[in-house]
């Protein structure tokens, strides 16, 4: 993604003591440069001169590119999903051939039937979305199908849906066990073999916050973290405040370097500041020496 | 589509008889399943005489005997002979037809159906 964020310039004394000016990069940032025709800007760390002003890319921002953003988008899918391959066997319908055509009437008569009677089966099952016949074969009627689980995202995303397709075992099993033929008759929607269920496999969407909010920010991956605030992620450097893990420049501002996040202490008409944190004020003396 | 009409029905006298006929139209009743089934005022349809392409038939208990479903192919009809009707047989009858070879007695499973033919046993 690109970013253009202007920048202001400020008096700032470093942690160590010496006066910088900011925005500043740090010594070890790789920098490269842009010109396009008569315009040279030193758009760094692979931004490039758009006529107008740099574009950046991701983490970086400022008029050069030189400075790195205390946040970065990350956006997680609005919802999650699971789909299981299971197979059951089903007693009450003979298998014919025109079944393994999924054109035909019989197979449309039958998905309509088979449909009808999982969405019974996982009535209860809030994440339960429907399911999908991907093949019929002979014995009476194997079918093969998934079952389509989906919730909205959370940080717990993963349980949710591991919890859903407990459930759904737990049912299939049921209804197949319950629901079999007596003398050759059926007299539920669909009668089945108790023995045929099965399931094949489970694949839940995998998505990982932390892993994005790492690739995002490339060089700087150790320094970025994930807080959530209402359920929702946020990729944050310790510069970026209101989040447990920011860090109080007090007297200073925060500033993102290769070697992590770090505090540039301000120097004010009466004090300057230093420490780690700029929470170590010094009052200047009110005499002046002349040389 | 299939689409199935019935007739046939009417008033009868306990122990009297009656055979309702039932004509589909399409070309799929060389194959499938086909029945009837009932449903008297206040009750839920159920299964009376039913039977699929693969020679399976069924008769629900309170018929066997009395009643007999057949089909004549060449006519695309289907038949169910009524005998020694009794009181409460008194219900409206439905033909009901899939082009799947069912083992099923609920009527949920069965996809084509006809109006519906009214038989009264009064005497």
């Known amino acids: 993604p690109l970013a253009t964020i202007p920048v202001s310039t400020t008096s700032l004394t470093s942690s160590e003591g010496s006066t910088i000016s900011t925005p500043s990069v740090d010594i070890s940032t790789p920098v490269t440069t842009s010109i396009v025709g008569d315009q040279c800007s030193r758009c760094k760390n692979g931004g490039f001169w758009d006529g107008l002003k740099c574009q950046c890319l991701t983490p970086y921002y400022g008029e050069s590119c030189e400075e790195v953003v205390n946040s970065i988008d990350i956006a997680p899918p609005e919802t999650v999903s699971a789909q299981m391959e299971l197979t059951v066997t089903v007693t009450s319908v003979k298998f014919t051939d025109e079944l393994k055509n999924h054109s035909s009437q019989e197979f449309r008569e039958f998905n309509k039937t088979f449909t009808e009677q999982m969405n019974i089966v996982y009535s209860g099952i809030p994440e339960y979305v429907g399911v999908n016949i991907t093949n019929l074969r002979l014995g009476s009627v194997v079918v093969e199908h998934d079952v389509l689980l989906r919730t909205k995202y959370t940080p717990e995303y993963k349980t949710a849906l591991d919890n859903a397709t407990e459930v759904v075992k737990q049912k299939i099993t049921k209804v197949t066990t319950e629901q079999i033929m007596t003398n050759d008759n059926c007299s539920a929607l669909m009668c089945f073999n108790t023995t045929g269920t099965q399931v094949q496999n489970i694949t839940v969407t995998q998505y990982d916050p932390v892993e994005e909010c790492r690739q995002k920010a490339e060089e700087y991956e150790d320094y970025f973290l994930v807080e959530y605030r209402d359920q929702k992620p946020y990729c944050i450097s310790p510069c970026e405040s209101g989040f447990n893990a920011s860090k109080n420049c007090n007297h200073g501002k925060c500033q993102m370097s290769q070697n992590g996040a770090r505090c540039l202490c301000v120097t004010t008409e009466t004090h300057w500041y230093s420490g780690e944190d700029c929470n170590q004020g010094t009052q200047k003396s009110h005499h002046h020496h002349h040389h | 589509e299939v689409q199935l009409v019935e007739s046939g029905g009417g008033v009868v006298q306990p122990g009297g008889s009656l055979r309702l006929s039932c004509a589909a139209s399409g070309d799929t009743f060389s194959r499938g399943s086909w029945g009837w089934f009932r449903q008297a005022p206040g009750k839920e349809r159920e299964a009376v005489a039913l039977?699929?392409?693969?020679?399976?038939?069924f008769y629900a208990d309170s018929v066997k005997g009395r009643f007999t479903i057949s089909q004549d192919n060449s006519k695309n009809t289907l038949y169910l002979q009524m005998n020694s009707l009794r009181a409460e047989d008194t219900a409206v009858y439905y033909c009901?037809?899939?082009?799947?070879?069912?083992?099923?007695?609920?009527?949920?499973?069965?996809?084509?159906w006809g109006q519906g033919t009214m038989v009264t046993v009064s005497s």
């Open positions: 009901a037809a899939s082009v799947l070879v069912l083992r099923t007695l609920n009527p949920k499973a069965w996809h084509h």
């Open positions: 039977i699929s392409s693969d020679g399976w038939t």
